[in-house]
Interface confidence: medium
């Protein structure tokens, strides 16, 4: 009724003084490899000389934190997070950040990064668009109230209004150049 | 200024659900997270959940089979809603909103005293 | 979870004289980008809670100099150095280093 081997585990590793043997009714707890977290119960048990129970160890990294516009990054970048790990931002001048000045990983998702609104209620430049470009030339700041002009290359269809507008800083939702369905 | 207005039930019996919506002024909700704090009768603080600026939430592993949090930008509403209430859930519940710095919470609303009885 | 232990519970003080809040964390609060997310609370009677210091000494917007917060690693205090009238209530400290955010079980603050 005894145990042999330890049963493996994808990314989770065994507790404990490693033993040839284990008694009926014995427990081994596992531990996730860093950038794991346990998903359910931690142990196996030993019962009739097979052990039942299953550690499950999921990934909750995070990889790429996100793109803040008119900010850049001032904590160390990694290729990879683990859960808890913070990515602190700031804002370029004359921005101003709104919002937590961090984002964290959490189980695999970033929390929500801030903003960084010209406090002036100007815009920086319009936001580029997928196989479509501005009609004028782009400058690094527009009054507000001010608007350009997205036209798509060639074969491309626009989708949504083709002029944006700055509001409070902002620039209102820019229209998709999609390519046509062919027949 | 900042303001976060809280309205809810003050009494629910046991097994209920309780319901709370925490209006915001002053801030957007697209800008700033909130979370949910409360606080048993002559005790501390006690961390539940927040929701992040972007809609996903987060939640104190204690609560999470019980504990939703949601909102809607556009009203400037968030809702809580935690189920199957018990006696021990008696209390002051509030919500806050996340600060800039390292995720305080700066702002808080003027709380809902909810007893659980029968 | 983190455990946030205060000392002590209850903190009698004479106006204009300096008090001293503890605070004991059960894991270092020391993330891995360096810096300490420890803050610190006031709770005045009848009122929700308001944010005085944030990342250990940092102070929050409209918060009197008198209040400095200190620690490193484990061991935190918040300090006031002439203690008024409108300083009395229950003092929190709060860690939002690891998930779940905690928060000590609260230092009363009152006249002697």
């Known amino acids: 009724t005894d145990c042999l081997s330890l049963p493996s585990f994808e990314n989770a590793i065994p507790m404990g003084e490693k033993k040839d043997v284990y008694k009926a009714g014995e427990q081994v707890t596992y531990t996730c490899a860093t950038y794991y977290k346990m998903d359910g119960a931690s142990n196996v048990t030993c019962i009739n000389s097979r052990w039942t129970g299953r550690p499950t160890c999921r990934d909750t990294s995070c990889v790429n934190p996100p793109t803040v516009q008119n900010a850049y990054i001032v904590s160390r970048q990694m290729s990879k997070y683990p859960s808890g790990e913070r990515v602190r931002y700031q804002c370029r001048s004359p921005y101003e950040m709104f919002g937590d000045e961090e984002v964290m990983c959490l189980n695999g998702n970033w929390t929500e990064p801030p903003q960084c609104k010209d406090s002036t209620g100007k815009c920086g430049p319009p936001p580029p668009i997928d196989n479509g470009d501005i009609t004028s030339f782009p400058l690094s700041v527009y009054a507000p109230a001010s608007s350009v002009e997205y036209q798509c290359q060639n074969l491309y269809q626009l989708e949504g209004n083709k002029r944006i507008t700055c509001r409070n800083g902002q620039w209102s939702e820019p229209p998709k150049c999609l390519h046509p369905c062919v027949i | 200024q900042v303001q976060l207005k809280q309205s809810g039930p003050g009494l629910v019996q046991p097994s209920q659900s309780l319901s709370i919506t925490c209006t915001v002024s002053g801030f957007s909700l697209t800008n700033y997270g909130v979370h949910w704090v409360r606080q048993p009768p002559g005790k501390g603080l006690e961390w539940l959940g927040v929701?992040?600026?972007?809609?996903?939430?987060d939640y104190n592993a204690a609560f999470i089979s019980r504990l939703s949090i949601s909102k809607d930008n556009s009203k400037s509403q968030v809702f809580f809603k935690m189920n199957s209430l018990q006696a021990d859930d008696t209390a002051i519940y509030y919500c806050?909103?996340?600060?800039?710095?390292?995720?305080?919470?700066?702002?808080w609303g003027q709380g809902t005293s909810v007893t659980v009885s029968s | 979870d983190v455990v946030m232990t205060q000392t002590p519970l209850s903190l009698p003080v004479s106006l204009g004289d300096q008090a001293s809040i503890s605070c004991r964390s059960s894991q270092s609060l020391v993330h891995s980008n360096g810096n300490t997310y420890l803050h610190w609370y006031l709770q005045k009677p009848g009122q929700s809670p308001k944010l005085l210091i944030y990342k250990l000494s940092n102070r929050f917007s409209g918060v009197p100099d008198r209040f400095s917060g200190s620690g490193s690693g484990t061991d935190f205090t918040l300090k006031i150095s002439r203690v008024e009238a409108e300083d009395l209530g229950v003092y929190f400290c709060s860690q939002s280093t690891h998930v779940p955010f905690t928060f000590g079980s609260g230092t009363k603050l009152e006249i002697k």
């Open positions: 929701i992040w600026s972007g809609g996903n939430t």
């Open positions: 806050a909103k996340n600060g800039d710095y390292g995720y305080t919470m700066d702002y």
